[in-house]
């Protein structure tokens, strides 16, 4: 009996009330391996979910967020709030990064700038709130007297995608 | 100095996984990003995602979200990928690389690892 | 994504030659702009970053120059040892993209 239900292939399951037949999944839901007594009930993508791959007989739906907010979590468990770039999400909202920390997206946590002493270099272009700092040359490499990071590049948004 | 360097070339059949590891040294692994870059053959080069791995937070280019998954592990100074359910279009070559004091550039490269998806 | 459009997609010049490679992103990427060179054998290296800044230990015949949306390449004076292909990348916005890649020959 076990070998018929494992001839049931995907998009089917092993129907115990009609002699092990092998039936379609019901609709909105799927079996994505072969020989399964049931199929699982399909994902549905409300509120902040939306629809990224519809369900078929064979495969789960599958959920993205929708504008203003961005996946966490394996296969998009969760929806978590953008914020503006120099921002991070905090249990109180969106707050600015403090002085000496950047985050260039609208999702993560404020990070510290690059030490660029680190590598033996200096700051070739200082940090803000939405950039980190760029590192240039050692200290060595630059000539007697000239000046190690150039301001910034005027602020805007580089419009960084939420991933 | 400071060195990436890449597992040896993979062939794989069509539908299975590959892993491919890049292992750091001469700096301190968590504090620069690791990105991934595929070349196909003949083709230019594409960023695939990276790696903070002092927190392993991840970035990636949306093309890949569903194809590659990038990891670090932080006692053996060794940033992953795997890429799952394998096409002949996933023939290419992998580099590892290390930003230049800041994520924006990147001034250390892997050697490459070259994976083959052949039936 | 920013589209970066390469140009030539290959030239070949002669040894002394002046030559120069042009990237145009889609949009503004102020300098977050960098060129690579990938030698024959695939090995990849970082020639010049932020636009114009030259890492330490290239020599000064490569020279970059540019910001926005329109940015140049340079080497002043073509050698036999910089037969290679030359990619462009922004570093501005997520996900960072190169340019196609220019295969320079020497004639």
């Known amino acids: 009996l076990q070998d018929l239900c494992s001839n049931c292939p995907a998009g089917t399951f092993c129907d115990n009330n009609r002699s092990q037949i092998c039936s379609p999944c019901p609709p909105n839901s799927f079996s994505s391996a072969g020989g399964q007594r049931t199929c699982d009930i399909c994902r549905q993508c409300k509120g902040v979910f939306k629809t990224r791959k519809e369900c078929s007989s064979t495969s789960n739906a599958e959920c993205d967020c929708i504008s203003g907010y961005h996946c966490l979590g394996a296969e998009c468990s969760m929806c978590e709030q953008d914020c503006k770039q120099g921002q991070e999400l905090t249990k109180k909202g969106c707050k600015d990064c403090c002085f000496g920390t950047f985050n260039d997206q609208k999702r993560g946590i404020c990070r510290p700038w690059t030490n660029c002493s680190l590598d033996g270099k200096s700051v070739l272009v200082n940090g803000t709130k939405e950039r980190d700092v760029v590192c240039g040359p050692s200290p060595a490499d630059l000539s007697p007297g000239a000046s190690s990071a150039t301001p910034p590049a005027p602020a805007r948004e580089p419009g960084h995608s939420p991933q | 100095q400071v060195q990436l360097v890449q597992s040896g070339a993979e062939v794989k059949k069509p539908g299975a996984s590959v892993k491919v590891s890049c292992k750091a040294s001469?700096?301190?692994?968590?504090?620069?990003?690791i990105n991934w870059v595929k070349q196909a053959p003949g083709q230019g080069l594409e960023w695939i995602g990276n790696i903070y791995p002092s927190d392993s937070y991840t970035n990636y280019n949306q093309k890949f979200k569903d194809k590659a998954t990038i990891t670090a592990d932080k006692s053996t100074s060794t940033a992953y990928m795997e890429l799952s359910s394998l096409r002949s279009e996933d023939t290419a070559v992998y580099y590892c690389?290390?930003?230049?004091?800041?994520?924006?550039?990147?001034?250390?490269w892997g050697q490459g690892t070259t994976v083959t998806v052949s039936s | 994504d920013i589209q970066m459009t390469q140009s030539p997609s290959s030239l070949s010049a002669s040894v002394g030659d002046r030559v120069t490679i042009t990237c145009r992103p889609s949009q503004d990427i102020s300098n977050y702009l960098n060129w690579y060179q990938q030698k024959p054998d695939k090995t990849v290296k970082l020639l010049i970053y932020?636009?114009?800044r030259l890492r330490s230990g290239v020599p000064s015949r490569f020279s970059g120059s540019g910001s926005g949306t329109d940015f140049t390449f340079t080497i002043s004076s073509l050698q036999p040892e910089d037969i290679a292909t030359y990619f462009c990348?922004?570093?501005?916005?997520?996900?960072?993209?190169f340019g196609q890649g220019t295969k320079l020959e020497i004639k």
């Open positions: 932020y636009t114009s």
């Open positions: 690389t290390r930003d230049y004091g800041s994520s924006y550039s990147y001034n250390v």
């Open positions: 990348q922004q570093g501005d916005t997520l996900p960072y993209t």
């Open positions: 001469g700096y301190t692994f968590t504090s620069y990003w």
